[in-house]
C-alpha cells in the first residue's frame, strides 16, 4: 500500500499556501483527485509528489495514491481543506442525476472543517427543503439525501453559517429520474379493421412510461408513417399518442399495422390487420354438422359463427317444422362476440321432445343482405315392437311391428316353456330377418318395418319373441301360443314412453 | 486493465434524444472520473463532459441540453442529449479522464447520424 | 473558455525527419494540465502527452512535450511511418475542457 506523506488523513492550510504531498509505493504510483487549479505533478520511479504553491478553496478534496502495479489495489489518501474565509464550499459538479430511491451525493465539499456544525441544505433562493427530505452531512463529500424522490428535482445550494450569516455555495441541479421498470406500455386500437373501400378509418397507436425519454412510431407494412404526435402526462405517466386518421380507404390502405415503442430498456410492439372490402359481407359457417341426430330426452347446443361487416342489423333463430308452429324460446338463443367483427350464436335445447325434431334456421341481417344457415334434427328413439298372430294366403303368421330411430334391425327366437323373454338356456332357435319391410319411412319421425314368421303349427308349450335393436336400444315382445288361441306379452319393462 | 465500449443507436430523428451507454470493464466505475467527447466527421474533439459518482460539470455550449448518468451496478455511464439536429451527427466517444493525467482510456467510439 | 490553437494545420516531413507541433493558448494554463492526444484514421485518439511533458505509459521516447504558460510543443525527435496522423493538444485545468483543431502529420 502506497504511503502519503504527510502522514495526517486531513490537511488544513490557508489560502495561497504552499502544499506538497508525497506519494511512496513500491512500483510506480499515481495520484487521482478533485479536477482542481494550480497543481504540479512530478513523478520520479516509486514516488510522485503534487504540489502547489497557490492553494485556493477549488483544491479542497481528497486526494488519492494508487499504485497501478498492486494486485491488491491499495490506495492511501490524504483530504485538504483551504479555509478561505470567503469561499466555505468547494463544488465539485453542477449536477448531480440519481435513479429514484438511490441516495444522491451533492458534491459541496466544506473548506473549514470547523464550520461543519453550521451547515445546511437550501434550495435556491432560500426556499426551505420539501417535506420528508431526509439528509446528512460529510465535510469530505457533501450532503446526501437519502433514498431520493422525482418530486425532489430541484436545484440546491449548501450553506454555512460565518460570522453570524449564512453563505451559500453555487447552485447544485439534482435529477431524479423515474426507474424504467421495461419498454414502454402499449395500445395501438383497433385489435383488427374492417372498412369498406372509400369510408373513412382512424388507428391510435399509443405508448406510456414513467420516463419521458422514449419513442413511439406507427409503420405499415414495415414503412414507418410520418403522424404528428400528441404528448401528455397523467397518472404520473408520459403518454405519446399517433393518430392515423384515413378519409376515404383504399386498397392499398390495407395490411399489417405495427405501433412500435422503445427506450432504453428496450423495445415493445404490437400488430394489428386493417382489411378493406368492396362491399359489405356477411359469412354464416358452423362447426358443426348441419345434419343433426340426437337421443330423445338428451340436448343439444346448435352453434353459429357469424363474420359481417358492417355490423348486424338483426339476427334470430327460428324453427321450420315439420312438427308444430313452436318457435324456440328466446332465452334459450344467446350470442357472444369473439372480436369486432366475429361472432357466435348458439341455441340451446335441452330435454328433446319428439315434436321438436326438425329444421332450425339461423338467419342474419345487415347492409349486405339476409343469410341463413339451416340445421336438420332427428331424433333417435329406441324400438318399440308389438307382435300378432294372423293368416297370409292361407298361412299362419306372425306379425312383428318395430318402430324407432335409426331402422331397427329384427331377430325372432323360439324357447321352450311360457315366458315374458326368452333366455339362453331356453331358446330353441334364431331367425334373423336381414330385410324387413318398411312401413313408414319419413323425415324426422320414426322408422316402421314389419317382419313376418310363418309357422306351418304354433307349438303350445312354447314362446315366439320378437326382439329389435338399434343404435339407441332394444326392444322385445313375447307371444305365447295357448289352447283357446294366441296370447301376446309385451315386455315387463317397457323401453319407452312416447 | 480498463476498457470502454460505447453503445446506442447509430441514428436518430432531429428534435429526438440521443443516447448512448458506455460500459466500463476491468475495473471500478466509482474510482474515477469519466468523460464523453464527441468528433464531428472530418472535424476535431468537442468536449462534452465528465461525471463522477453521481455528480456532473459539463461543456456550457451543451450544457441545456446533455444529462450525463452513471449506474454503479452496470458499471455504466450514459450520455443523453436532448433535441437532437444534423450538428449533433458525430462519433461520440467515452473516456476515463484523470485529473494529472488526461484522458488515458477511450473507447472505440461509436458514430451517430442525426437525420429524418 | 480557453481556445487552444494548433499551427501548422498540416505538416509534410519524411520518415526520419524531426517534427515540431506547436499548441498556444488564449491564456496562462497551468502546464500540469495540458495533454497531447495522437488518432488515426477510423480510431480513437491515444493519450501520448500529459501535464505537458511526461509520456504516458507506453509511450515511446521519441515523443516529448514541452513549453509553459501559453506556449507548448510536441516535439517527435525521429519520425516513424506508424507517426502520421492527427495530433491534437488539450487543456484540462479550467471547465470547459478545450482541445485545438488539431494539426495533420503526413508523409512527404
Known amino acids: 500500500i502506497p504511503v502519503i506523506e504527510p502522514s495526517v488523513p486531513e490537511l488544513v492550510v490557508k489560502p495561497g499556501a504552499t502544499v506538497t504531498l508525497r506519494c511512496v509505493g513500491n512500483g510506480s504510483v499515481e495520484w487521482d483527485g478533485p479536477p482542481s487549479p494550480h497543481w504540479t505533478l512530478y513523478s520520479d520511479g516509486s514516488s510522485s509528489i503534487l504540489s502547489t504553491n497557490n492553494a485556493t478553496f477549488q483544491n479542497t478534496g481528497t486526494y488519492r495514491c494508487t499504485e497501478p502495479g498492486d494486485p491488491l489495489g491499495g490506495s492511501a489518501a490524504i483530504h485538504l481543506y483551504v479555509k478561505d474565509p470567503a469561499r466555505p464550499w468547494n463544488v465539485l459538479a453542477q449536477e448531480v442525476v440519481v435513479f429514484e430511491d438511490q441516495d444522491a451525493l451533492l458534491p459541496c465539499l466544506l473548506t473549514d472543517p470547523v464550520l461543519e456544525a453550521g451547515v445546511s441544505l437550501v434550495r435556491v433562493r432560500g426556499r426551505p427543503l420539501m417535506r420528508h427530505t431526509n439528509y446528512s452531512f460529510s465535510p469530505w463529500h457533501g450532503f446526501t439525501i437519502h433514498r431520493a424522490k422525482f418530486i425532489q428535482s430541484q436545484d440546491y445550494q449548501c450553506s454555512a453559517l460565518m460570522g453570524g450569516r449564512k453563505v451559500m455555495s453555487i447552485s447544485i441541479r439534482l435529477k431524479v429520474q423515474k426507474v424504467i421498470p421495461g419498454p414502454p406500455a402499449l395500445t395501438l386500437v383497433p385489435a383488427e379493421l374492417v372498412r369498406i373501400r372509400g369510408e373513412a378509418a382512424q388507428i391510435v397507436c399509443s405508448a406510456s412510461s414513467v420516463d419521458v425519454n422514449f419513442d413511439v412510431f406507427l409503420q405499415h407494412n414495415n414503412t414507418k408513417l410520418a403522424i404528428p404526435q400528441q404528448s401528455d402526462f397523467h397518472n404520473n405517466r408520459y403518454q405519446k399518442v399517433l393518430t392515423l386518421n384515413l378519409d376515404q380507404v383504399d386498397f392499398q390502405h390495407a395490411g399489417n399495422y405495427s405501433c412500435v415503442a422503445s427506450n432504453v430498456q428496450g423495445k415493445h410492439s404490437t400488430s394489428m390487420f386493417f382489411r378493406v372490402v368492396e362491399s359489405a359481407y356477411l359469412n354464416l359457417s358452423s362447426e358443426q354438422n348441419l345434419i343433426q341426430e340426437v337421443t330423445v330426452g338428451e340436448g343439444l347446443n346448435l352453434k353459429v359463427m357469424v363474420e359481417a361487416y358492417p355490423g348486424l342489423q338483426g339476427f334470430n333463430w327460428t324453427y321450420l317444422g315439420p312438427f308444430s308452429d313452436h318457435q324456440p324460446e328466446p332465452k334459450l338463443a344467446n350470442a357472444t362476440t369473439k372480436d369486432t367483427y366475429r361472432h357466435t350464436f348458439t341455441l340451446s335445447l335441452p330435454r328433446l321432445k319428439p315434436s321438436e325434431a326438425g329444421r332450425y334456421s339461423f338467419l342474419a341481417r345487415n347492409p349486405g343482405g339476409w343469410r341463413a344457415l339451416t340445421f336438420e334434427l332427428t331424433l333417435r328413439y329406441p324400438p318399440e315392437v308389438s307382435v300378432i298372430w294372423t293368416f297370409i294366403n292361407g298361412s299362419g303368421t306372425l306379425l312383428c311391428a318395430a318402430s324407432g330411430y335409426p331402422q331397427p334391425n329384427v331377430t325372432w327366437l323360439q324357447c321352450s316353456g311360457h315366458t315374458d323373454r326368452c333366455d339362453e338356456a331356453q331358446v330353441l332357435q334364431v331367425w334373423d330377418d336381414p330385410y324387413p319391410e318398411v312401413l313408414s319411412q319419413e323425415p324426422f319421425h320414426k322408422v316402421t318395418v314389419q317382419s313376418l314368421l310363418t309357422v306351418e303349427t304354433l307349438e303350445h308349450n312354447q314362446t315366439y319373441e320378437c326382439r329389435a335393436h338399434n343404435s339407441v336400444g332394444s326392444g322385445s315382445w313375447a307371444f305365447i301360443p295357448i289352447s283357446a288361441g294366441a296370447h301376446t306379452h309385451p315386455p315387463d319393462e317397457f323401453l319407452f314412453t312416447p | 486493465q480498463v476498457q470502454l465500449q460505447e453503445s446506442g443507436p447509430g441514428l436518430v430523428k432531429p428534435s429526438e434524444t440521443l443516447s448512448l451507454t458506455c460500459t466500463v470493464s476491468?475495473?471500478?466505475?466509482?474510482?474515477?472520473?469519466w468523460s464523453w467527447i464527441r468528433q464531428p466527421p472530418g472535424k476535431g474533439l468537442e468536449w462534452i463532459g465528465y461525471?463522477?459518482?453521481?455528480?456532473?460539470t459539463k461543456n456550457p455550449s451543451l450544457k441545456s441540453r446533455v444529462t450525463i448518468s452513471v449506474d454503479t451496478s452496470k458499471n455504466q455511464f450514459s450520455l443523453k442529449l436532448s433535441s437532437v439536429t444534423a450538428a449533433d451527427t458525430a462519433v461520440y466517444y467515452c473516456?476515463?479522464?484523470?485529473?494529472?493525467?488526461?484522458?488515458?482510456?477511450w473507447g472505440q467510439g461509436t458514430t451517430v447520424t442525426v437525420s429524418s | 473558455e480557453i481556445v487552444l490553437t494548433q499551427s501548422p494545420g498540416t505538416l509534410s516531413l519524411s520518415p526520419g525527419e524531426r517534427a515540431t507541433l506547436s499548441c498556444r493558448a488564449s491564456?496562462?494554463?497551468?502546464?500540469?494540465?495540458l495533454a497531447w492526444y495522437q488518432q488515426k484514421p477510423g480510431q480513437a485518439p491515444r493519450l501520448l502527452i500529459y501535464?505537458?511533458?511526461s509520456r504516458a505509459t507506453g509511450i515511446p521516447d521519441r515523443f516529448s512535450g514541452s513549453g509553459s504558460g501559453t506556449d507548448f510543443t510536441l516535439t517527435i525527435s525521429r519520425l516513424e511511418p506508424e507517426d502520421f496522423a492527427v495530433y491534437y493538444c488539450?487543456?484540462?485545468?479550467?471547465?470547459?475542457?478545450?482541445f485545438g483543431q488539431g494539426t495533420k502529420l503526413e508523409i512527404k
Open positions: 473516456a476515463r479522464w484523470r485529473t494529472f493525467y488526461g484522458m488515458d482510456v
Open positions: 476491468g475495473g471500478s466505475i466509482s474510482s474515477y472520473y
Open positions: 461525471i463522477y459518482y453521481s455528480g456532473s
Open positions: 491564456q496562462s494554463i497551468s502546464s500540469s494540465y
Open positions: 501535464g505537458a511533458s
Open positions: 488539450q487543456q484540462y485545468g479550467s471547465s470547459p475542457y478545450t
